[in-house]
């Protein structure tokens, strides 16, 4: 399995964001695929649990992405990607994307760098 | 390194009330949300609730609703746990355990003795 | 809430050997998690997400499953993996752990 991400994302505080995923893959996409999506903060505190799907989505139950996560992607597609809502500066930090689709072999995780940021304010255009 | 440090094991009589603390350190105490599991003698595991460290929401096991309290002191990144009306069937160890990619990283766990 | 089965409840085995532990699901979840503890110590996490490593986890324990019936197998057990084992489900709440399986030295 190869993956591909947009490495870099740039997004406005109070937002949602498509964290982009996508994959290749010799073997055909059937319900052997799972993705699993995790994020690492920017403080370096411990990985946190974002999205799983196998067969159908799961959000998870408990933590700072429940209830504000959803899927985006189409299997059938090669696309893995998901919809983070409501963004926050705290979401600052490393988004990974892992895709295993038996019997092919794991690739390299693919990483998103999301960097959430202020509104622009009238007075700053105004400035540009 | 993340640490969490409950505080020490209590003997309580029927009726009576707990409240066990759970001390983070070595992490951002706020980004994740603090759980507690409670073990009695020999027996498995059952999830009691959890806290929100950011704005104290809850959600709890309804097995417990209307006698356990979770609260937590941002100040002093400590959360707690308090279980009243206890009975025997309440003698547990009780933990306190922060969800990550599962639940990660445990206290080191209270013993609660309910005895007359 | 849902109920989850392990079998066996107890497992003897020797070191070198191949361990497979069963949970059953009382209905569907989307996903397992498998926790290792010994006595007098808090559980440690071993599997998120039913096929995910926890970290420092090493690569003899794997999982697997879907639906009702998931997987915990260690491929050639180590001294130190004689321990109880717990799975739990985190589908929807309450989150809920299974009885345990005693993996002991045969």
């Known amino acids: 399995v190869e993956i591909y991400t947009s490495r870099v994302l740039e997004a406005v505080n109070g937002t949602d964001a498509r964290l982009k995923c996508t994959f290749s893959s010799f073997a055909p996409v059937g319900d052997a695929l799972t993705v699993t999506w995790n994020f690492r903060p920017l403080d370096g505190g411990p990985e946190q649990f974002v999205f799983y799907y196998h067969i159908d989505p799961f959000q998870p139950m408990s933590g700072r992405f429940k209830d504000r996560v959803s899927w985006d992607g189409n299997p059938e597609r090669y696309d893995a990607s998901i919809l983070l809502w409501k963004l926050q500066f705290d979401d600052n930090g490393t988004y990974t994307c892992q895709v295993k689709n038996p019997p092919d072999v794991d690739g390299v995780i693919g990483e998103i760098r999301l960097s959430v940021v202020h509104t622009v304010r009238f007075s700053e255009i105004h400035f540009l | 390194q993340v640490q969490l440090v409950q505080s020490g094991a209590e003997v309580k009589k029927p009726g009576a009330s707990v409240k066990v603390s759970c001390k983070a350190s070595?992490?951002?105490?706020?980004?994740?949300?603090m759980h507690w599991v409670r073990q009695a003698p020999g027996q498995g595991l059952e999830w009691m609730g959890e806290i929100n460290p950011t704005n104290g929401g809850t959600d709890y096991n309804e097995k417990f609703q209307g006698r356990v309290t979770m609260t937590v002191d941002k100040s002093t990144s400590t959360a707690y746990m308090e279980l009243s009306s206890l009975r025997s069937e309440d003698t547990a160890v009780y933990y306190c355990?922060?969800?990550?990619?599962?639940?990660?990283?445990w206290g080191q766990g209270t013993l609660v003795t309910v005895s007359s | 809430e849902i109920v989850l089965t392990q079998s066996p409840a107890t497992l003897s085995l020797s070191p070198g050997e191949r361990a497979t532990l069963s949970c059953r699901a009382s209905s569907s979840v989307g996903y397992m998690y498998w926790y290792q503890q010994k006595p007098g110590q808090a559980p440690r996490p071993l599997i998120y997400?039913?096929?995910n490593r926890a970290t420092g986890i090493p690569a003899r324990f794997s999982g697997s499953g879907s639906g009702t019936d998931y997987t915990l197998t260690i491929s050639s057990l180590e001294p130190e993996d004689f321990a109880v084992y717990y799975c739990q489900q985190w589908s929807s709440n309450p989150p809920t752990f299974g009885q345990g399986t005693k993996l002991e030295i045969k």
């Open positions: 070595g992490y951002t105490f706020t980004n994740y949300w």
């Open positions: 355990t922060i969800y990550t990619t599962a639940l990660d990283y």
């Open positions: 997400v039913t096929s």
